[in-house]
Interface confidence: low
């Protein structure tokens, strides 16, 4: 189709190299047209537009992206051949920076229902550099967490450097919608709550002699509790003596709580200590079985092939620790009594007599 | 512990706005999202839309036109209308909490059911 | 919209039988995907979230696994409270929708 008709806009993605960042490109539709076709229309509920050119209400097509090589070859469609490009509805998502990025991005409906359609598009010219070394080293970062319940701010990481009195006015948007009540480069939340997380966009506009360029920036924004002032705590093993058939195999669960950190490194481990001899276990990964705002449970296995008699006079510790500190359980294995026949107490020796030869050549020494 | 519970009439004539309204007791409305699901009967379930404590919205697309719905935090109550019932809308109406649970990133859970309110479409 | 694909759509299973649920979606949700229980004549009642996760309370029999567009729940040993209609539904974009639902019935 012929772009020659289309709307022209400028930006500008002033990367990191310090940093993970996505960026964002909005499918601008002339209005009416963009609050018909994507779920971000920037009139409020009471202003109705007089006529809808493009298509029957009851239809939210999606858009089509293109990007225009710089060669003059034809348009190429965004989802073929670019795979850290994302489309979703009305937006561009790039999940990489880099300079290979630059490039002109067109969208338009999908559905073309009539001969005024064909001109309804927009064509970004979308420049990405690294931002330079001499920018300032406290930039705001493009994660940023806002903690429930109490007062926050989402700075704006290519203005986060300016004073607010020198700072331009900036257009925010937050999953695409349009933020109206603010125009500074710091959003203020009085309150925390959980709804505050998701994309925000904040652009501004950068002049020279020649053009006009919008600079924008991504953040995710994280809602997040305080980190936790405790030791984690084990909810299971609950009981430190755990009845056991000699000759059948076992699974001893160990699961614990850790309260919510920022920076949340978690270590589980089991070990065993028999007589002066302590080694940790090698055991399947350990997994998350609930998250939740405050905490998460992490539960890990030990699995035993089949209880021997050496393992009714080994204790079996499960270790848990997050930044503020550790928490153990020890289990002690008890015969459960009268269960297994003679058979089963012959098997179990032979298979310690077994392991005793194995654990004589390896003795793996933990501490 | 959060119930929901839900009230209002279980008939309505066709052609005019059904209201029901779901009260959150044992917890607050903050911080939440408010669902509406209906389930015709034998059939499955389809999600009518949300409300946050803030009072931002979002419906489903197939019942946008004839929807609203509101909260009042003040009474811990949120509420559905639907407007220009047919028969097609006769269903079960649950209310339900949404939680984003957080861990790295977000996603959500309805975690609490409101005991459901049988709406007849009829003349 | 996303459509979500359960099969079977009904099974008879014995107590005591291992019982396996399928959700297809009709593109990738990443592991956006929850598992309800429903009893006749109740609400839907939350067992599975983020497709692996199970919620507080819920008996360990039950698991769920998967990502993208194939999803699955297993009951590792039905039990007579378990015979419901089972549904599936995406959080991955809205609007947010429901399986048509699996009811697993006594043999």
């Known amino acids: 189709f012929n772009i020659s008709g289309c709307s022209t806009k400028k930006l500008l993605w002033a990367y990191s190299t310090r940093s993970e960042e996505e960026f964002i490109l909005f499918c601008d539709l002339p209005e009416p047209q963009k609050s018909h076709f994507c779920h971000r229309s920037q009139l409020s509920p009471t202003q109705v537009p007089d006529h809808l050119p493009f298509t029957d209400s009851k239809d939210l097509p999606d858009v089509q992206w293109y990007r225009q090589p710089s060669n003059g070859d034809p348009l190429e469609d965004i989802r073929k051949s670019y795979p850290h490009i994302i489309q979703d509805k009305c937006t561009l998502r790039f999940l990489t920076p880099g300079v290979n990025n630059t490039g002109s991005y067109i969208c338009r409906p999908k559905m073309i229902k009539s001969p005024y359609d064909v001109a309804c598009c927009v064509k970004m010219i979308l420049e990405v550099k690294p931002q330079s070394n001499a920018s300032c080293e406290n930039s705001a970062s493009h994660k940023q967490d806002l903690l429930l319940g109490s007062t926050g701010s989402i700075s704006c990481p290519s203005l986060s450097c300016q004073s607010d009195a020198q700072s331009p006015e900036v257009t925010w948007y937050k999953n695409g919608k349009l933020l109206s009540m603010t125009r500074s480069n710091r959003i203020v939340v009085d309150e925390v709550y959980i709804y505050h997380q998701g994309t925000y966009v904040c652009d501004y506009t950068q002049s020279d002699t020649a053009s006009s360029w919008t600079v924008r920036a991504v953040v995710q924004v994280r809602t997040i509790v305080g980190d936790t002032k405790l030791k984690p705590d084990i909810l299971d093993p609950v009981e430190s003596t755990l009845e056991v058939e000699l000759g059948k195999p076992l699974t001893i669960s160990c699961k614990a709580r850790f309260g919510f950190e920022r920076v949340f490194n978690p270590v589980m481990k089991w070990y065993i200590k028999d007589a002066d001899l302590e080694w940790e276990v090698s055991v399947p990964e350990a997994k998350s079985i609930k998250s939740t705002l405050k905490d998460e449970i992490i539960e890990r296995n030990i699995i035993l092939e089949k209880v021997t008699q050496r393992d009714l006079r080994r204790t079996f510790v499960c270790f848990v620790q997050n930044s503020i500190g550790n928490t153990t359980q020890s289990v002690q294995l008890k015969e459960k009594r009268g269960s297994g026949g003679l058979n089963d107490i012959f098997e179990a020796q032979k298979i310690e007599w077994h392991e005793t030869v194995r654990f004589q050549s390896h003795h793996h020494h933990h501490h | 512990q959060v119930q929901l519970q839900q009230s209002g009439p279980g008939l309505v004539k066709p052609s005019e706005t059904l209201s029901l309204t779901c009260t959150v007791s044992g917890g607050s409305i903050s911080n939440y999202y408010w669902t509406w699901i209906r389930q015709p009967p034998g059939k499955g379930l389809e999600w009518i839309g949300y409300?946050?404590?803030?009072?931002?919205?979002n419906y489903n697309p197939s019942l946008k036109s004839r929807v609203t719905i509101s909260v009042d935090t003040s009474k811990n109550q949120f509420s559905l209308k639907l407007s220009s019932v047919t028969a097609a809308d006769t269903a079960v109406y649950y209310c339900?909490?949404?939680?984003?649970?957080?861990?790295?990133?977000?996603?959500?859970?309805?975690?609490?059911w409101g005991q459901g309110t049988t709406v007849t479409v009829s003349s | 919209a996303i459509q979500l694909t359960q099969s079977p759509s009904s099974l008879s299973a014995s107590v005591g039988d291992r019982v396996t649920i399928t959700c297809r979606a009709s593109q990738g949700i990443s592991s956006a995907l929850a598992w309800y229980q429903q009893r006749p004549g109740k609400a839907p009642k939350l067992l599975i979230y983020d497709a692996s996760n199970w919620e507080s309370g819920v008996p360990s029999r039950f698991s769920g696994s998967g990502s993208g567009t194939d999803f699955t729940l297993t009951i590792s040993s039905l039990q007579p409270e378990d015979f419901a209609t089972y549904y599936c539904?995406?959080?991955?974009?809205?609007?947010?929708?429901f399986g048509q639902g699996t009811k697993v019935e006594i043999k």
């Open positions: 409300i946050s404590d803030s009072g931002s919205t």
């Open positions: 339900a909490r949404e939680t984003i649970v957080v861990r790295g990133f977000y996603f959500y859970v309805m975690d609490v």
């Open positions: 539904q995406q959080f991955n974009s809205y609007p947010w929708t």
